[in-house]
């Protein structure tokens, strides 16, 4: 048993038919030594008296807030949590899988560019009872420091039958160059807690393995005369590092009617600008990746050809 | 240290075209690690990263952007001296931070070549033969340090007289290569930068 | 399976013309782009020009240009090369390659030599 | 136009040897670069596109790398049936240019 927070505790269970549980001692924080009585949750049944209470956890019924009382009066509680481990591996019940870039990708992090900011995201079908905590820390062993607010609910969507909600924090560390060379990883711990479960999620990362730029901006088309080629030009976008001349990006220009599987143009350049041939009905887009190590690709920046 | 925007002549950057091709070099060699050593630890998330430089050469911070010594996180207080007389600086009015941020380049590049001959070595002695380093990288090593073309004290090769431990050797390799692939992407933004500048 | 079908051998005289054919099957005609690239004997490949069959838009070498028509008909689904003012240099074999991609070639057909000898 | 240069416009190589082919673009184009193979009498066949993607069907031993303008196509462990010419052509620009070829010969 462990603290999570003031009068937050977690018990870890090997989770098995049968499994002999945790024998956990509570102390009621309180002076007094008599007349102390113990309830668990609504229920008014008297588990047991005396300043300390020993209970079995084996299973969610035994979890919950544990209250000790004097005379109707209430001196302290605390709240039980159950953390399962099943054939020695923790349960990960809250969180789905993303499956992307592998599978047990729990947390996803993105960042604009290589000022030390991120935002994780994760899903879940749970609507209710559900709080999230987020730390984070530049290495482990001398962690330094990285800030990161709320989680908050940022998309909800419907899947099949069931709802899916995106919850996503946002962190900064808190010195960060952007041109330094990092060798310790971004270390994201997110715990999770479900009415009287509770699991913890991480992720380990360099910033430079999860940018993603945003797209180019100000897309912009000229007809070039006697041809059917245009001259596309565009912008850095207003959120990646600075010097572009130090952080440069590449781009992948592409002209491509509505479905994907429609003929297309596609040119890939350093420049910030390109010759495409346009086509009626179709759109020109571009979108940008860092030039010297290849991260993620940008979402497209989209204009229609005519 | 910082670079000032400085304005080389517009034939300063033979550099650029030599940083461009360490990159490809280093990175192609980085992938061919990891497909031929598939059951080591070979990954990015697998290695320790270790930077053979660290305390010898300053390179992110002798060759940081006039734009970001504003930013105190970027301003370390580590001291080298460097010597100045490279072919890439194409005037003598060529300031002394870009000198010490291109002799700082040269150093690194000294340092990871002794290095990764003396690995190569002890690969050709292995009896499963299973990876070499890729001569062209080697040579395009040594390209850019002609290219910066700066006088310094020759190191020695590492010669060690113990039977090499193969399996260690081979992951050694792999954490040289994450981190020379790191610093190779420093250098062409550094080049990069300077070019445009 | 994409396969494109080129028509036959054709002997020239300098200064006539010359149309070769190139059928498609085994895709939908208009959602590939058309190319010719010709290649003379014991030389390299150079390409002339591509034809959008969906809406008849072509793009030619500039060297070629006033010499060279590339037509597509969707009915036939055939793509069609005419050469004119042919002259002894213009002897080579004429391929046709189609892509969804305009700027490289995924399918080939198996080549028409033209041969040009007074 | 832009030109491409292809080195060495002839190898010489065995059966298991390691053959790098290195095309040069008369000015950048970034990774808007394709491999062909061609065998005597028969069209060209498509091997890598933009630079280093590699086809369906294309034995993995054929890998390509390069941008800007230096580029190679790398044949790891040669086979009999990769005797043949290939050439490289960039797609940066129209007129779509190919390099003169490299001949890959038996020693």
């Known amino acids: 048993i462990w603290e999570l927070k003031k009068d937050v505790y977690v018990v870890e269970l090997d989770w098995y038919p049968d499994a002999p549980g945790e024998m956990v001692v509570l102390t009621c924080d309180t002076p007094e030594e008599d007349g102390i009585t113990w309830t668990l949750d609504q229920s008014s049944e008297v588990l047991g008296s005396g300043k300390t209470l020993t209970i079995q956890v084996k299973e969610f019924g035994d979890a919950g807030q544990y209250t000790c009382h004097k005379g109707g009066e209430v001196l302290s509680h605390s709240l039980l949590l159950l953390h399962k481990k099943e054939d020695g591996i923790w349960s990960t019940d809250i969180l789905k899988d993303q499956k992307e870039p592998k599978n047990k990708t729990f947390l996803r992090c993105e960042a604009k560019n290589y000022s030390g900011r991120f935002t994780c995201w994760w899903l879940t079908t749970i609507s209710t009872d559900l709080t999230f905590s987020v730390k984070s820390s530049r290495g482990s062993s001398d962690p330094q420091g990285v800030t990161c607010g709320a989680a908050t609910l940022s998309a909800e969507r419907v899947r099949g039958d069931n709802k899916e909600y995106e919850y996503s924090v946002e962190c900064q560390e808190d010195s960060a160059c952007p041109a330094a060379e990092e060798s310790l990883p971004i270390e994201v711990m997110v715990d999770a807690v479900h009415k009287l479960k509770y699991e913890n999620y991480t992720s380990s990362f360099f910033i430079r393995d999860i940018i993603k730029p945003d797209p180019p901006k100000n897309l912009q088309l000229k007809p070039l005369k006697n041809s059917r080629q245009v001259e596309v030009s565009w912008e850095y976008p207003d959120t990646w590092s600075t010097p572009h001349s130090y952080f440069s990006l590449t781009f992948c220009v592409q002209v491509q009617g509505k479905s994907k599987r429609e003929k297309k143009d596609r040119v890939f350049t350093d420049k910030t600008s390109a010759t495409v041939i346009c086509r009626k009905n179709a759109s020109i887009s571009v979108r940008a990746q860092d030039r010297y190590y290849s991260s993620s690709w940008s979402e497209w920046a989209s204009v229609p050809c005519s | 240290r910082n670079l000032p925007v400085a304005t080389p002549d517009p034939g300063m950057f033979p550099c650029l075209h030599h940083s461009q091709n360490l990159l490809r070099a280093v990175s192609n060699m980085l992938q061919k690690a990891r497909q031929t050593l598939e059951f080591y630890p070979c990954t990015s998330e697998e290695i320790d990263h270790e930077d053979i430089t660290k305390d010898k050469t300053s390179t992110v911070e002798a060759c940081l952007p006039l734009e970001l010594t504003k930013n105190e996180s970027c301003l370390n207080s580590r001291e080298t001296s460097f010597i100045t007389n490279g072919s890439c600086l194409a005037s003598r009015k060529t300031s002394f931070m870009m000198a010490l941020c291109l002799s700082s380049i040269y150093e690194d590049l000294k340092m990871y070549q002794v290095e990764f001959k003396t690995m190569n070595a002890k690969l050709l002695m292995d009896p499963k033969r299973q990876i070499f380093l890729d001569q062209n990288m080697l040579a395009v090593i040594d390209e850019l340090m002609q290219a910066l073309n700066f006088n310094s004290e020759t190191v020695p090769q590492k010669s060690s007289l113990e039977e090499p431990d193969f399996y260690k050797t081979k992951i050694k390799l792999c954490i040289l290569l994450h981190a020379f692939r790191i610093r190779a992407v420093t250098i062409d933004r550094v080049m990069s930068y300077l070019n445009a500048s | 399976e994409v396969q494109l079908v080129q028509s036959g051998a054709e002997v020239k005289k300098p200064g006539a013309t010359v149309k070769i054919s190139c059928k498609a099957s085994g895709y939908t005609f208009s959602d590939y782009y058309l190319h010719w690239v010709r290649q003379a004997p014991e030389k390299g490949l150079e390409w002339m020009g591509w034809i959008d069959p969906e809406n008849g838009d072509t793009e030619y070498a500039p060297k070629f240009q006033g010499r060279v028509t590339i037509t597509a008909d969707t009915s036939t689904d055939t793509g069609y090369l005419e050469l004119s003012s042919l002259r002894s240099e213009d002897t080579a074999v004429y391929y046709c390659?189609?892509?969804?991609?305009?700027?490289?070639?995924?399918?080939w057909g198996q080549g028409t030599l033209v041969t040009v000898s007074s | 136009d832009i030109q491409m240069t292809q080195s060495p416009s002839s190898v010489s190589a065995s059966v298991g040897d390691r053959v790098t082919i290195t095309c040069r673009a008369s000015?950048?184009?970034?990774?808007?670069l394709h491999w062909y193979q061609q065998k005597p009498g028969k069209a060209p066949k498509l091997l890598i596109y933009f630079a280093s993607q590699s086809i369906s069907g294309v034995p993995s031993r054929f890998s390509g790398s390069g941008s800007g303008t230096d580029f190679s196509l790398t044949i790891n462990s040669l086979q009999p049936e990769d005797f043949a010419r290939y050439y490289c052509?960039?797609?940066?620009?129209?007129?779509?240019?190919f390099g003169g070829g490299t001949k890959v010969e038996i020693k």
């Open positions: 052509q960039q797609s940066n620009s129209f007129p779509l240019t």
């Open positions: 390659a189609a892509n969804k991609e305009l700027r490289y070639f995924d399918v």
């Open positions: 000015q950048s184009i970034s990774i808007n």
